[in-house]
């Protein structure tokens, strides 16, 4: 008689990342008997929900169910039916929803209520939808990349199983860029974290970590662009805004009402003598960079050292993984290679921004014009944020690794979020026989 393969003893988990510009659904899988081991959870699927972020549905909340259908159906297909009822589903909303909540708590709650109702209709074990804090977003991103890089494993190896591995147990810092916020998280070197709001203490796998984190709301790439436009239109002499962050020959009409729709532009709001203005690209990296720097207030710092806007930032330490839009933008610009110096990146950005819009459109015919038009700004913004905002230098630039995936799993906060909520990161180092879950992050 033939040996029948025993059914795989695996578990699944689903996390939806409801970001400001889009929602992604991630499906994770792990061996059931190795729950407490480090590095065993991996991503088996990413489904990008077709459409914008959930905060855009504020005027049509009843349609959120349709919007989520396709990816939830995908989850139903990928996960074996026998596992559906025990598969947890979590939805975490980030800065897009934080901004909506700032405008109206009632509207944000209404969106989340409909999301919860929609997700409860599926055969999974729905665990809730909530707006996660910026601190959580930073912390879970840090946990994700270090978990995937094997930094929490006590077993030292003489060989490298993952990229960027430096064979020591020193953790990587995490740099996350979204559409509406950006996070910086790392373990400083023997440095007191001077502001309690930015301090996290973890005990993971028997080791203590004192982690610095901060989330800059309104400094994601999309909201930073709105801020820059709102700032620059203040000093425009008429309804033409000659903008160095867009390619020469690019033109776009912007409604002033759209500009002032977001809480991020409130500080620049003024009564303008026109309802619309036209952006006219002039494609100049240096001028674009200068304009972006005006978004960072570096004139005051109540601590020994600050990033910007009076936010404490310890001296940078170690290697950093830069993911999400840091990666997507730099990947598009072909600037993710470890060999590309900061000077070379700047040089290439100068050339890219100076290229005429018609030429750019021809070269990248498959890319939606709205996205395509913003890469000059986004690339320049990334450089400005990392160099002037976070104080990376030409020398420390080589410690930044632009990461999309590690071992097949996307870098981002979702894996860390699930590991925590499913109690899969024990405080103590597991013995060979699994311990009962005691304390977790």
């Amino acid at each position: 008689t033939q040996n029948k393969a025993l059914p795989e003893n695996v578990k699944y988990g689903i996390v939806l990342d409801a970001g400001s510009s889009h929602t992604s659904l991630y499906i994770y899988k792990w061996p059931a008997e190795k729950e407490n081991d480090t590095g065993v959870v991996h991503q088996v699927e990413e489904c990008r929900v077709k459409g914008p972020g959930i905060s855009k549905f504020v005027q049509k909340v009843n349609e959120i169910g349709i919007y989520l259908t396709d990816c939830m159906e995908r989850a139903r297909e990928v996960i074996p039916r026998s596992q559906h009822q025990e598969t947890p589903v979590y939805l975490g909303a980030t800065a897009g929803m934080r901004l909506l909540r700032m405008e109206s708590e009632e509207l944000a709650d209404r969106v989340l209520d409909v999301v919860e109702r929609s997700l409860s209709n599926y055969p999974f074990d729905f665990q809730g939808a909530r707006i996660i804090t910026g601190q959580e977003e930073g912390a879970y991103g840090w946990i994700t990349i270090n978990y995937l890089l094997g930094k929490f494993s006590q077993k030292t190896r003489w060989f490298s199983i993952v990229p960027y591995e430096t064979n020591n147990q020193e953790t990587f810092g995490a740099l996350d860029l979204g559409g509406a916020s950006t996070q910086v998280t790392f373990v400083p070197q023997n440095q007191t974290i001077e502001s309690p709001d930015n301090a996290l203490q973890f005990r993971l796998y028997g080791k203590d970590y004192n982690v610095y984190t901060h989330s800059f709301l309104c400094y994601g790439k999309d909201q930073a662009l709105w801020q820059k436009l709102a700032k620059d239109i203040q000093v425009a002499s008429n309804e033409i805004l000659r903008d160095p962050c867009f390619h020469p020959g690019y033109k776009k009409v912007v409604n002033v009402s759209d500009l002032y729709k977001t809480p991020c532009t409130k500080r620049f709001e003024m009564t303008l003598p026109f309802q619309q203005f036209e952006i006219q690209g002039i494609g100049n990296y240096q001028q674009c960079h200068q304009s972006i720097l005006e978004l960072f207030n570096t004139s005051y710092c109540p601590y020994s050292q600050c990033a910007f806007n009076g936010i404490f930032l310890p001296p940078l330490q170690g290697d950093f993984g830069a993911f999400s839009a840091f990666y997507f933008v730099m990947k598009f610009l072909n600037l993710t290679s470890e060999k590309v110096s900061q000077e070379k990146v700047t040089e290439m950005m100068k050339k890219f921004c100076a290229q005429p819009w018609e030429e750019i459109k021809t070269s990248y015919a498959g890319v939606k014009e709205k996205y395509l038009s913003e890469y000059c700004f986004s690339g320049t913004y990334i450089l400005s944020l990392l160099l002037q905002g976070y104080h990376f230098t030409a020398d420390s630039w080589e410690h930044i690794h632009f990461i999309g995936k590690i071992q097949g799993s996307d870098a981002g906060w979702t894996l860390g979020y699930m590991l925590n909520l499913t109690n899969m990161i024990p405080a103590e180092q597991p013995l060979s026989t699994p311990l009962s879950h005691s304390t977790y992050v």
Partner: antibody
Framework: EVQLVQSGGELVKPGASVKISCKVS????????LNWVRQAPGKGLEWVGN????????RYNQKFKGRFTITIDQSKNTAYMQLNSLRSEDTAVYYC??????????????WGQGTLVTVSS | EIVLTQSPASLSASPGERVTISCSAS?????MHWFQQKPGQAPKLWIY???NLASGVPARFSGSGSGTDYTLTISSMEPEDFATYYC?????????FGQGTKVEIK
Amino acid sequence: EVQLVQSGGELVKPGASVKISCKVSGYSFTDYNLNWVRQAPGKGLEWVGNIDPYSGGTRYNQKFKGRFTITIDQSKNTAYMQLNSLRSEDTAVYYCGLYGYDDDANYFDDWGQGTLVTVSS
Amino acid sequence: EIVLTQSPASLSASPGERVTISCSASSSVSYMHWFQQKPGQAPKLWIYATSNLASGVPARFSGSGSGTDYTLTISSMEPEDFATYYCQQRSSYPLTFGQGTKVEIK
């Protein structure tokens, strides 16, 4: 605006194969699933399958799985459907289409003009 | 798969008349979509998510329903409304269409 332009009609013999195409423009190719629907002469609409250009994942109506294959060429912003082992009952207009929410959460649904595939000896 | 059954299969109506088309699903669906198709043309989305009119669709059209039973209603027929109407569910795969209801001039 979104446009889907399909390849011209095809006359093929039973048992033969044909590959039809759908070129899209006006949006980012990876943003939406690309669906194929067919309609036999005088008959109703029948969903064949779709592809998610972002992940490359495909889904098929069980009826067509194994015989019809949906692919994409991202560099050309084009989706294809290969029809194999054709029979006379596969004679139909084949439409490509996509639907979903745009950046402002407005629902849209766009179709190509259709490609008539005639299977006849 | 979810089977959608439309009724009637065809109907004749006069301009100004009220017309109702039903679509019954073999199991519950979250939403129903409706398409209008005229001879030689690709189908056009007419009503989405059960009750929302697609862009450019006149207000005499309406949609309603939930669970397994859905309806498209034309409050007062106009000459341009004579066409075939299909319901479609996009709640689970495979996506399925009703067999169509042909609305002809009496």
